[in-house]
């Protein structure tokens, strides 16, 4: 058993048939010695009396908020949560495996630039009695500070018969130099509590590997005289690291017909303009990627040809 | 990433072209190592990230863009003790810091060159003959060093009398290639910045 936060404890349970469970001794936080009674989760039924209460925790129903009272007055609370281990593996029931970029990916993170700010998100089908808390650091043995906000519900989607909920959190490395060469990864730890179930999820990454620029901005077309060609121009996204001559992007320009089956023409360039042939009903899209370190491409910025 | 790449203008900052070739060569070599040594811990997640230039050069600090010198987090250990000549500087007025920067890059290349050559000598003795260093990568390191043209003592190639542990050597190769790729990215950014200045 260990303390998650003040008055909240996690009991780690090996889960198998006839498992003996874990004996837990709760002590009432009071100088009083006599007349103390114990209750569980808002029930008035008395479980026991005395300054300590010994319980055998074997399953979820044995957890909950234990309260000690004296003469109708609440003296202290202890909330017990369960962390379940089956066949040597901690449970991952609360979050959905996103399977990208590989199996057992529960947390996904992205950064728009090298400032040390990044966003992580995760998915669940659980809608109620759910709380998350996020901690992060650079490195684990001698951790350097990363500050994370509160996790918030950022999207809801319907997937077949199920509703899926996306939560996200923003974190910022306390003292980040955009030009630094990372040698220690960022560690992100998410504590998830659903009802009386505790689970934890972790992700480890370098900012350089989770970079995904915003799409190029101000995408414009300029027709060239007496030609089907157009000059496409764009700018670096506002969120990208500066100076741009140091943090350079490379771009992919695509001409796509109305039908998805039509052949796509693609051009790669380091410049912020390109000349392409604009077909009727086609659209021109441009996306960006770090020029020197091939992490993710941005989403497309698009304009119609007409 | 196999994309069409534009060739640089002849009037361009002379080292930019070489640094682009360097990044391409080390990225290709790292990809080859990952594929060939698929049953060794050779991915970014599996290896220890070591920097052989740590405490010997300070390329990131010395080559910091002016715009980032206001950022306190970037100024923790600025070194000021490098050689100040070199042909990449020939055609433009350059500050003391730029000279420090380019000499620091030169020292990095020299250190990696020695390590890679020593390692290649060991790998050539491996009866499995599983992986060797790409001669093109070694040549590109040499070309960039020549373009930087700093006069410095030649470092003798390390020789070892004991029997090489080929497993350890291959893991060390992965560590070295990952670190060198990161440094090559920094070098490319620096050359691009200097070219635009």
């Amino acid at each position: 058993i260990w303390e998650l936060k003040k008055d909240v404890y996690v009991v780690e349970l090996d889960w198998y048939p006839d498992a003996p469970g874990e004996m837990v001794v709760l002590t009432c936080d009071t100088p009083e010695e006599d007349g103390i009674t114990w209750t569980l989760d808002q029930s008035s039924e008395v479980l026991g009396s005395g300054k300590t209460l010994t319980i055998q925790v074997k399953e979820f129903g044995d957890a909950g908020q234990y309260t000690c009272h004296k003469g109708g007055e609440v003296l202290s609370h202890s909330l017990l949560l369960l962390h379940k281990k089956e066949d040597g593996i901690w449970s991952t029931d609360i979050l959905k495996d996103q399977k990208e970029p590989k199996n057992k990916t529960f947390l996904r993170c992205e950064a728009k630039n090298y400032s040390g700010r990044f966003t992580c998100w995760w998915l669940t089908t659980i809608s109620t009695d759910l709380t998350f808390s996020v901690k992060s650091s650079r490195g684990s043995s001698d951790p350097q500070g990363v500050t994370c906000g509160a996790a918030t519900l950022s999207a809801e989607r319907v997937r077949g018969d199920n509703k899926e909920y996306e939560y996200s959190v923003e974190c910022q490395e306390d003292s980040a130099c955009p030009a630094a060469e990372e040698s220690l990864p960022i560690e992100v730890m998410v504590d998830a509590v659903h009802k009386l179930k505790y689970e934890n999820y972790t992700s480890s990454f370098f900012i350089r590997d989770i970079i995904k620029p915003d799409p190029p901005k101000n995408l414009q077309l300029k027709p060239l005289k007496n030609s089907r060609q157009v000059e496409v121009s764009w700018e670096y996204p506002d969120t990208w690291s500066t100076p741009h001559s140091y943090f350079s992007l490379t771009f992919c320009v695509q001409v796509q017909g109305k039908s998805k089956r039509e052949k796509k023409d693609r051009v790669f360039t380091d410049k912020t303009s390109a000349t392409v042939i604009c077909r009727k009903n086609a659209s021109i899209s441009v996306r960006a990627q770090d020029r020197y370190y091939s992490s993710s491409w941005s989403e497309w910025a698009s304009v119609p040809c007409s | 990433r196999n994309l069409p790449v534009a060739t640089p203008d002849p009037g361009m900052f002379p080292c930019l072209h070489h640094s682009q070739n360097l990044l391409r060569a080390v990225s290709n070599m790292l990809q080859k190592a990952r594929q060939t040594l698929e049953f060794y811990p050779c991915t970014s997640e599996e290896i220890d990230h070591e920097d052989i230039t740590k405490d010997k050069t300070s390329t990131v600090e010395a080559c910091l863009p002016l715009e980032l010198t206001k950022n306190e987090s970037c100024l923790n250990s600025r070194e000021t003790s490098f050689i100040t000549n070199g042909s990449c500087l020939a055609s433009r007025k350059t500050s003391f810091m730029m000279a420090l920067c380019l000499s620091s890059i030169y020292e990095d290349l020299k250190m990696y060159q020695v390590e890679f050559k020593t390692m290649n000598a060991k790998l050539l003795m491996d009866p499995k003959r599983q992986i060797f260093l790409d001669q093109n990568m070694l040549a590109v390191i040499d070309e960039l060093m020549q373009a930087l043209n700093f006069n410095s003592e030649t470092v003798p190639q390390k020789s070892s009398l004991e029997e090489p542990d080929f497993y350890k050597t291959k893991i060390k190769l992965c560590i070295l290639l990952h670190a060198f790729r990161i440094r090559a990215v920094t070098i490319d950014r620096v050359m691009s910045y200097l070219n635009a200045s």
Epitope: W15, S43, I55, E59, F60, G61, D62, G64, K84, K195 | -
Partner: nanobody, 124 residues
Amino acid sequence: EVQLVESGGGLVQPGGSLRLSCAASGRTFETIAMGWFRQAPGKEREFVAVIRGSGVATYYPESVKGRFTISKDSSKNTVYLQMNSLRAEDTAVYYCAATTNRFKNTDYTTYDYWGQGTQVTVSS
């Protein structure tokens, strides 16, 4: 999902005893409490006995206290209701139920899973 199957109901004389069993299957580890509720014709469903977890707490209404005992065999995923000193007013359909809710474990509206029920008739 949790499936519940009751057994052990029947006809018994006043003052007699019966033991009901409820076998649970499926995601039983998600349940917080299991209980027995009963419903007599034309009456609302009422709480008879609840066991929390592996037995950390048991709850009974005054009407059955001292006569009925709820117990659980976690290894068999089975909950039992031992009914002694049965009275005519104990006649009803007895339902086994399971909840994943922490609170109000004596309120049948908070229960997620129900068995099909077993008839208990106390009559001479």
